[in-house]
């Protein structure tokens, strides 16, 4: 018999694999939903179940999951069925493993750290490579050297500073220079040499309604590549923007509702109202995407429990063009990159 999806957190005990290979049906159609949606614990998303029927509280990391009881997409979770072979009916919510990277023709898996050469240590995170320098020689010691020179030292990876401006002094290597300069307390070597890197924001994960956008940045205290995320809403799903296109025009680049409203997220409400701009639509094959935007911080207040803040895409202007054959494809903006096929697959 089919199990109707339930609104509460689900726990399942899979039958021993040798006992059954029949796959239970967790969805029943037509949909059957409780008269009112469940109240989810703080931080747990209220989402539509995997049967596309009822509102449920999303399964969290480590929870059991099924076709009906799906994992929290807002937390980047997916249902890993690998432990339920051969039925693949009941899984466990796991963190989404991002796409790998290709650098100089070499493929790296997501999360893999590697050294493309002796001077850099790199990490692949969700298709983006972030690197930190291993050669931590400071700036040349200004204390006495007016004409410093960066030279390769046989048998060593990192170049070192030498000073040519004083014939009376023997050539100094970086070891001496580093000691002299570090003693002065003028620089913290590791972060002085951090090559700041921030990737562009990925396209919004949805073409309408609330989605998520991510980027990689090493602009942090450890100079380590980390994924940042922000919420995005390119356009509302519940407004027919085409109705707002002026007569004789084919596009409305920007749609802005007349009323200011609060943002809502997982049952929590923004502490102030906003009147955001959204990207519009076209009646032809063009699509409209942001080209002037920024990230703002929005504070949310929850009915029960503490509030929180989230980074949110704030659109200032959009443009409409033909460069979006599949606007749902979050990797669409990589198509012009070399090795796109490798990254996307």
């Amino acid at each position: 018999t089919a199990l109707s999806p339930t609104p509460t957190t689900m726990t399942f005990t899979p039958a021993p694999l040798e006992e059954t290979t029949t796959r239970p049906e967790f969805c029943k159609w037509p949909c059957e939903c409780p008269q009112s949606p469940p109240r989810c614990p703080l931080g747990v998303s209220l989402i539509t179940d995997g049967c596309e029927c009822c509102k449920i509280c999303a399964q969290q990391l480590g929870d059991n999951c099924t076709e009906a009881a799906i994992c929290d997409p807002h937390r980047g979770l997916y249902c890993d069925y690998s432990g339920d072979r051969p039925r693949y009916a009941i899984g466990v919510c796991a963190q989404v493993v991002g796409v790998g990277c290709v650098l100089d023709g070499v493929r790296y898996t997501n999360g893999e750290s590697f050294q493309p050469n002796c001077r850099y240590n790199c990490t692949c995170i969700d298709g983006t490579v972030g690197c930190t320098p291993l050669c931590l020689s400071p700036r040349p010691p200004r204390l006495w050297c007016r004409q410093p020179r960066h030279v390769r030292v046989p048998g060593q990876c990192c170049e070192q500073w030498v000073c040519d401006d004083d014939a009376r002094r023997p050539r100094q290597t970086a070891l001496l220079d580093t000691r002299a300069f570090a003693a002065s307390g003028a620089v913290e070597q590791r972060y002085e040499n951090c090559i700041a890197y921030t990737s562009p924001w990925s396209p919004c994960s949805t073409t309408c309604g609330l989605g998520i956008s991510t980027r990689i940045s090493n602009v942090n205290a450890r100079c380590w590549p980390e994924q940042e995320s922000r919420l995005c809403n390119l356009r509302p799903c519940d407004v027919d923007i085409q109705l707002h296109i002026k007569a004789g025009k084919k596009c409305l680049a920007v749609y802005q509702p007349e009323e200011a409203t609060n943002f809502t997220l997982a049952g929590c409400v923004s502490t102030r109202t906003y009147r955001p701009k959204y990207c519009g639509v076209c009646t032809d094959n063009r699509c409209c995407i942001p080209y002037k935007s920024k990230t703002i911080s929005v504070d949310f207040q929850c009915p029960e429990g503490p509030g929180f803040s989230r980074q949110v895409l704030w659109i200032n202007a959009c443009f409409c063009n033909l460069s979006c054959r599949n606007p749902n494809d979050i990797f669409a903006d990589l198509e012009s990159y070399p090795d796109f096929e490798e990254i996307a697959n």
């Epitope: 939903c33 049967c51 596309e52 309408c208 309604g209 519940d238």
Partner: antibody, heavy 121, light 107 residues
């Protein structure tokens, strides 16, 4: 206000094809299952097809299976019905209807005004 | 497929009358039944859902009852605007099915 507006109805020859559209407004389109229901002249109502909120699940009446294809575009708030291999029995007013699954399962709560499809040589 | 049989298929009544329309299902459908009103050239309009719940905006003279296989729609105190065709719909299982309709005419 909540509204469904069908279009695309026409006179078509037997064996021909037609694509109906239904434009939705006034509600969160991507939250609802949607259906097509038809009514032959002077006859009763007949359910044709239903589609889930993100197109993952689809159901058809036996009378149209293999000939009709239901689809939707949530970005455009639109529902479609592609009708192939049409015959005189498909002559009807075609309604798009919203399934009320937000609170329990309660059938169709919103209907469009209908669009007429006539199959005749 | 579940078959719905409405009775009567047509009915003549006067303004102010109380009328009852019955819908029988070929198998149990719990309370997954709705009643719809349709006027000529118009789309159907939902009156009752879940067998007995009144749709918002529908006058309280309309009421529904029943569960399982036997359902009734009652209109107490007919008004001139109530003369139309009434359909029952089961949404307990696919394919959804409608009753053949009951035509309510002015006597």
């Amino acid at each position: 206000q909540v509204q469904l507006v069908e279009s695309g109805g026409a006179l078509v020859q037997p064996g021909g094809s037609l694509r109906l559209s239904c434009a939705a407004s006034g509600f969160t389109f991507s939250d609802h299952w949607l259906s097509w229901v038809r009514q032959a002249p002077g006859k009763g109502l007949e359910w044709v097809s239903s589609i889930s909120s993100s197109s993952r699940y689809i159901h058809y009446a036996d009378s149209v299976k293999g000939r009709f294809t239901i689809s939707r575009d949530n970005a455009k708030n639109s529902l479609y019905l592609q009708m192939n291999s049409l015959s005189a029995e498909d002559t009807a007013v075609y309604y798009c209807a919203r399934e009320d699954t937000s609170m329990a399962t309660n059938g169709f709560d919103v209907w469009g005004q209908g669009t007429m499809v006539t199959v005749s040589s | 497929a579940i078959q719905l049989t409405q009775s009567p298929s047509s009915l003549s009544a006067s303004v102010g009358d109380r009328v009852t329309i019955t819908c029988r299902a070929s198998q149990g459908i719990r309370n997954h039944l709705g009643w719809y009103q349709q006027k000529p050239g118009k789309a159907p309009k939902r009156l009752i859902y879940a067998a007995s719940s009144l749709q918002s905006g529908v006058p309280s003279r309309f009421s529904g009852s029943g569960s399982g296989t036997e359902f009734t729609l009652t209109i107490s105190g007919l008004q001139p605007e109530d003369f139309a065709t009434y359909y029952c719909l089961q949404h307990n299982s696919y394919p959804f099915t409608f009753g053949q309709g009951t035509r309510l005419e002015i006597k």
